[in-house]
């Protein structure tokens, strides 16, 4: 079914930041001694290359910035959400936090009032 | 159906580096002059926070590294790929049915040897 393609493409988008290191960390990749380690920049470039391959409307021959590529990735995924037109499942609640120290836990260090923008 | 969850979760992972600017560009967001710009670090932290919210098996109360979160995100999406790649069960001689929510519970576990590389 068509839904597989975007999920797989999206999977590439998330995963390939450190694809080889993940495979090695999980005992499934080649030993790092047998090949040159990829730098984070190489991993990032690889990720955007894969996105160019996987997302329609991002031809590899054109000059697009990383933000432009992400914009097209997002548009593509939003389109897929419209096609699927079903709500996503979610958790029952956030983490349990102590009443008094709740605002000081490591996960809550970033400014939380900014969180409403990524939904 | 739950198939949307990975797309949405993955969308958060890809999008939230620059979601507000995208919303503004597409005429959906507030003008940037009305609020403080988010730093890249804040966006990344928010992104992982959203992943914790969206991916089963990544309870927000636990301490997980970003790599561990991504590993679980990848495993989850791979699980969904397996489910999406197989026809959903239906009544004998009946029509093909959409994936049922029960098939995508957080407890869904596929054979881990299928998850070898980040492809």
């Amino acid at each position: 079914m068509k839904a597989l393609s975007p999920v797989r493409g999206c999977y590439e988008a998330v995963c390939c930041l450190s694809e080889r290191s993940l495979a090695i960390a999980r005992g499934r990749g080649k030993s790092p001694s047998t090949e040159e380690p990829l730098s984070l920049l190489d991993d990032m470039n690889h990720c955007y290359s894969r996105l160019r391959e996987l997302v329609p409307g991002v031809p590899r021959g054109t000059q697009l910035s990383q933000v432009e590529i992400l914009q097209r990735v997002i548009d593509y995924i939003l389109d897929l959400q419209v096609v699927l037109a079903e709500p996503a499942p979610g958790p029952p609640d956030g983490p349990h936090l102590p009443i008094q120290t709740a605002e000081l836990t490591p996960e809550l260090v970033i400014s939380k009032d900014k969180r409403s923008f990524c939904h | 159906m739950k198939a949307l969850s990975p797309v949405r979760g993955c969308y958060e992972a890809v999008c939230c580096l620059s979601e507000r600017s995208l919303a503004i560009a597409r005429g959906r967001g507030k003008s940037p002059s009305t609020e403080e710009p988010l730093s890249l670090l804040d966006d990344m932290n928010h992104c992982y926070s959203r992943l914790r919210e969206l991916v089963p098996g990544v309870p927000r109360g636990t301490q997980l590294s970003q790599v561990e979160i991504l590993q679980r995100v990848i495993d989850y999406i791979l699980d969904l790929q397996v489910v999406l790649a197989e026809p959903a069960p239906g009544p004998p001689d009946g029509p093909h049915l959409p994936i049922q929510t029960a098939e995508l519970t957080p407890e869904l576990v596929i054979s881990k040897d299928k998850r070898s590389f980040c492809h």
Epitope: D93, A102, E103, R115 | P56, P59, P106
Partner: antibody, heavy 111, light 111 residues
Amino acid sequence: QSVEESGGRLVTPGTPLTLTCTASGFSLSSYYIHWVRQAPGKALEWIGYISDGGTTYYASWAKGRFTISKTSSTTVDLKMTSLTTEDTATYFCARQGFNIWGPGTLVTVSL
Amino acid sequence: AVLTQTPSPVSAAVGGTVTISCQSSQSVYNNNWLSWFQQKSGQPPKLLIYETSKLESGVPSRFKGSGSGTQFTLTIIDVQCDDAATYYCLGGYWSTSDNNIFGGGTEVVVK
């Protein structure tokens, strides 16, 4: 740190009503906020929540008639439409973790 | 999902032990996302136990939670007069709706 509900009153069937949950001592944009109701002499009933990121989820019976939204960093609204006598209850808001509850606000739907 | 609690009322003598069960028709989130609340007349619920067995701050250690998946138990040892109340379980689920569901409540009467 506390929350308090307001807006409960006597209304006639079909009248829309909006309840407000107001936080003190913390920002609602940092936490999930749940709405729960309890009809007189009956069990607690979860209505829905709004997450810190603004995502909303509802009980299946509440979908379509109830809407949860953030109106500021200290207030969350519960909008109710097509009210019937069955919606007569005390409505509570609770913070993430369900360890902080408001005292409740009574909504009475009667002819 | 449906959460079924021990029928009310349950009687206990001061100093005795009370056990309340809560059964879910499907596994809760992470197999442990179940909470217990105490509610007295005219008051909001008070969280006692979260994530099956974790004691909320300030709650006496006489309250113990156990279970996993679909079957859960709240045990009150050395029952006190103050423990007379209605107790609710709350199950959490990874879902598109009905993410949280309360049990029907169990009234505990202390003799």
